[in-house]
Every structure is written in structure tokens, then in C-alpha cells.
Interface confidence: low
């Protein structure tokens, strides 16, 4: 029986993320019964991607690692509409490290996942990044120009964004 | 695939030195970097060195700067570490990586490892 074996499938992939993800929330993708995308319980997704915001102050450097140990690393921001969904669950009050560092401290950026640096697809606040001793990116929110990134001490511990992809069942 | 093979470990004497290669094959990392990690028996894996693939810039850990040094040869894809003034604590299995410097320097994680090689230094 084809459903039954795709099932028993599912089933043996659930087990093997549970090692990392006790809860995955799945939704069907478009009209197909077989295809599933999943997304750790409690994060959320957007397109083809899986978000977590970490609440815990940690700095750049645990926040990486705090997001590889759940297989995700620090959010790479590709898209506008990326960054606004992003914000639609972040607290004005708070900065949140993004995966984008500079760590020769001479304005080259890259980002965790080796996504090429894109200057047009950047959202930094004006005036920003202004010093080359602060070579982590995060993103916060002023109220002159609402959420956009600035450059920290990487050692200053903020909350942080992690990004995965999707995983399909 | 990336396929990272290191070379040159050895039993050496302490005072004395070892250069350590790593060839890489299967892609090469552009912008990024490549370093070396190391990990003593019973002990976590730590960074060592890393060397950016573009511009050069070169990282290093606290106790090995001064004695250690990093390189990279382009043409040949190959990073190298020089260690001079070897230590008896500086015994440990070194392995090459390559991953994007953020990740290599701050984190001190990679998604491409070699296999080590073997460096012990007798008192």
C-alpha cells in the first residue's frame, strides 16, 4: 500500500529529527498529500525557512553556536519581505543578532552561511555600520526609522534570530 | 564535496617545530576561510588559527600567537601551519577546516573537516 509506506517513512524521518526536535509542526504543501514541510514546535516559518528568536542574552559567538546545536544557524536576511516577516515577532525593546559579521574588522561582511554580501539587500540603519571595532550585526528598532541593522561589540550579549531550512517529510 | 587532507604531523622534540598542510579539493572557499582546530585526548576540539582565502587575514588563538603562523597558497589551494617552539601541551590530533570566517572565528565551528593529523611534542 503506497500511503502506508509513505507513512512508515515519515514516521522513521520524524524519529530521526527528534534527536534535535522533540515537536515538529507540519503543514501540507500545496494540494499533494505526500508532500509535508515541517518546522520545529515552537518556531515559526515563512517561505521556505524555519525562525526562532532566543530570548536568552548571549554573545554573537554562543548565539552561533546556541543555533548550530538546533541545526539552524544566526538568520541570513536575503529579501525584504524576509525582514518583515522577521519583525512581526520581535519586541521594539530588544536588539537581536543577525548570522552577518565582520570579523577582520574591514568592512567585509559575510554572512554565516556563505550567502555572498549583497549592499542592495541591506537594511542598516542611516549612519550605520559606523565603527570598525563593532564587527556583529544586529537588528533593533528606532523609532525615527523603525527596524534596521547596526553594528555591536561582538562580545555584548543580545538576544538573537536563528534561521533553518524547512525540513520535508 | 570538499575533501580536506592534512599532512606533516609527527613526534617532535619540545623547542622544535613541524609545518602542517592542508590540500583542499572539490571546491575552494573564495571569500571564506580556511583554519586548523586541534583536540587533545580527553579534551574538546579548539581553534587554533584561521587565514580569510582572499585577503589573507590571518586569527589566531591566544596561546599560539607569536609561534604559530598561518598561510595560504592560492595556486596550489593549500593552507599551512607553521608551529615553532613546540610544547609539550600543544599535543593533539590537528585538523584542517574551511568555512566562512564568521563561523570559523567566532564560532569556532566548521561544516568541512579533514582527518587529522597526529602532532606530539616529548619533553
Known amino acids: 500500500n503506497f500511503m502506508y509506506s509513505k507513512t512508515v517513512k515519515r514516521l522513521s524521518k520524524l524519529r530521526e529529527y527528534q534527536q534535535y526536535h522533540p515537536s515538529l509542526t507540519c503543514v501540507m504543501e500545496g494540494k499533494d498529500i505526500e508532500d509535508w514541510s515541517c518546522c520545529p514546535t515552537p518556531w515559526t516559518s515563512f517561505q521556505s525557512s524555519c525562525y526562532f528568536i532566543s530570548t536568552g542574552m548571549q554573545s554573537w559567538t554562543k548565539s552561533q553556536k546556541n543555533c548550530s546545536v538546533m541545526g539552524a544557524d544566526l538568520v541570513v536576511i536575503n529579501t525584504r519581505e524576509e525582514q518583515d516577516f522577521i519583525i512581526q515577532n520581535l519586541k521594539r525593546n530588544s536588539s537581536y543578532f543577525l548570522g552577518l559579521s565582520d570579523p577582520g574588522g574591514r568592512r567585509h561582511w559575510q554572512w554565516v552561511d556563505q550567502t555572498p554580501y549583497n549592499e542592495n539587500v541591506t537594511f542598516w540603519h542611516s549612519g550605520e555600520p559606523n565603527n570598525l571595532d563593532e564587527r556583529c550585526a544586529i537588528i533593533n528598532f528606532r523609532s525615527s526609522e523603525e527596524w534596521g541593522w547596526n553594528d555591536i561589540h561582538c562580545h555584548v550579549p543580545q538576544k538573537s534570530i536563528c534561521k533553518m531550512k524547512k525540513i520535508y517529510i | 564535496q570538499v575533501q580536506l587532507q592534512e599532512s606533516g604531523g609527527g613526534l617532535v622534540q619540545a623547542g622544535g617545530s613541524l609545518r602542517l598542510s592542508c590540500a583542499v579539493s572539490g571546491r575552494t572557499f573564495s571569500s571564506y576561510a580556511m583554519g586548523w582546530f586541534r583536540q587533545a585526548r580527553g579534551k574538546e576540539r579548539e581553534f587554533v588559527a584561521a587565514?580569510?582565502?582572499?585577503?589573507?587575514?590571518?586569527f589566531y588563538t591566544d596561546s599560539v600567537k607569536g609561534r604559530f603562523a598561518i598561510s595560504r597558497d592560492i595556486a596550489k589551494n593549500t593552507v599551512y601551519l607553521q608551529m615553532n617552539s613546540l610544547k609539550p601541551e600543544d599535543t593533539a590530533v590537528y585538523y584542517c577546516?574551511?568555512?566562512?570566517?564568521?563561523?570559523?572565528?567566532?564560532?569556532?565551528?566548521?561544516?568541512?573537516w579533514g582527518q587529522g593529523t597526529q602532532v606530539t611534542v616529548s619533553s
Open positions: 587565514v580569510e582565502w582572499s585577503s589573507g587575514s590571518t
Open positions: 577546516a574551511g568555512d566562512h570566517t564568521g563561523k570559523l572565528v567566532f564560532s569556532k565551528t566548521s561544516d568541512y
